[in-house]
């Protein structure tokens, strides 16, 4: 006899990266029919919703209106169909943004580069904080994680077409309260003369997932799409 | 900006009861979620009962079936009433709301709520 019901698929619109003081909406998708959702919050409970009717509602959704370094951290849901219970989701980490100060991002030997040179990123910032974390546009993100005591360097080494896009850094206090972000740095890769012309900055995704995050520093504005970064959801377990 | 302001709490007997009504000035109360939360003296801050917009509600183990929260809409009121008193109740009664929200989210966790009122204290003693 099933002991349990299956996992539950947590995820946060729009983005998992969240300024502070701007509003995010946790999903908690189950299934027809469960009675009862329970939010947790670094293990503990954090918030209840009972769907009406839950015959017609497989989907529920926990409103965060006001984001501070309290809320950043892992969460996680479950559902329940009578007195069954479902297995706990997958972790969602929750970060704040906009914490202290702004990086600065640079990239050497420069933006405009030939397919195959070395290239690195330097991303620098003078208050406390020894975790840096550069970001690309786009689904995939590339997110990676350096080291210094104001500086980490990126190095990505000999870079090909599918290096070209934007990138962002961030300084991190902790794994989920993070900086403002840096001005962006767009890479410009030429000298693959087969893919060059062909190639889009990235195939995976039309860069949506930085977009809606911008979107939320810059007005608030909710966006009804679950567009989160696996990448650096990874990154910070 | 969401002001609350309890009132309600005093001294009572073991197995008495008070009703804490937490007042809520400005026109958004009928999209918030209200929640109480108690701290006694040299303890953390604990929840105690929840309701949602929608009245769904949520109370700590502790309480049940001693403690019932409600709202009043048209008087921008969340009310809190105990019965069945005990020592350990004892504490500094606090309201809090959730603004804005959906209709169905009960918030338990002390770090989901955006407005605090000051405090009632109550006290259960022979």
């Known amino acids: 006899q099933q002991q349990t019901l299956p996992k539950p698929f947590i995820w946060a619109e729009p983005h998992f990266m969240v300024p502070k003081e701007k509003q995010v909406t946790i999903c908690c998708q189950g299934n027809y029919g469960a009675v009862e959702y329970q939010l947790h919050f670094e293990g503990s409970l954090f918030a209840v919703d009972r769907p009406k009717p839950p015959e017609r509602i497989n989907k529920v959704k926990f409103y965060i209106p006001d984001m501070n370094s309290r809320m950043a951290g892992q969460y996680s849901c479950i559902y329940r169909v009578g007195e069954l219970w479902s297995e706990p989701s997958n972790l969602l980490d929750l970060v704040v943004t906009e914490m202290y100060d702004t990086p600065t991002l640079s990239v050497h030997p420069g933006p405009e580069v030939i397919s195959g040179e070395k290239v690195t990123f330097y991303c620098r910032l003078d208050t406390a904080t020894s975790m840096f974390l550069l970001l690309k546009e786009g689904r995939s993100s590339h997110v990676q994680r350096g080291y210094g005591k104001v500086q980490a360097e990126f190095p990505l080494g000999p870079v090909t077409t599918a290096h070209r896009g934007t990138y962002r850094c961030f300084g991190s206090y902790n794994n989920h309260a993070w900086s403002f972000p840096s001005e962006p740095v767009k890479l410009l890769v030429t000298g693959d003369i087969e893919n060059t012309s062909l190639a889009p900055e990235d195939p995976t995704f039309p860069a949506d997932t930085w977009g809606t995050y911008l979107l939320t520093t810059e007005t608030g504005l909710q966006k009804d799409h679950a567009l989160w970064d696996h990448t650096a959801q990874n990154l910070l377990r | 900006e969401v002001q609350l302001v309890e009132s309600g709490g005093g001294e009572v007997q073991p197995g008495g009861s008070l009703r804490l009504s937490c007042a809520a000035s400005g026109r958004t109360f009928a999209s918030a979620a209200m929640g109480w939360f108690r701290q006694a003296p040299g303890k953390e801050r604990e929840f105690v009962a929840a309701i949602s917009r929608s009245d769904d509600t949520y109370y700590a183990e502790s309480v049940k079936g001693r403690f019932t929260i409600s709202r009043d809409n048209a008087k921008n009121t969340v009310y809190l009433q105990m019965s069945s008193l005990r020592a350990e109740d004892t504490a500094v009664y606090y309201c809090?709301?959730?603004?804005?929200?959906?209709?169905?989210?009960?918030?338990?966790?002390?770090?989901?709520?955006?407005?605090w009122g000051q405090g009632t204290l109550v006290t259960v003693r022979p």
């Open positions: 809090a709301a959730v603004v804005p929200t959906y209709g169905s989210n009960i918030y338990v966790h002390s770090a989901a709520y955006n407005y």
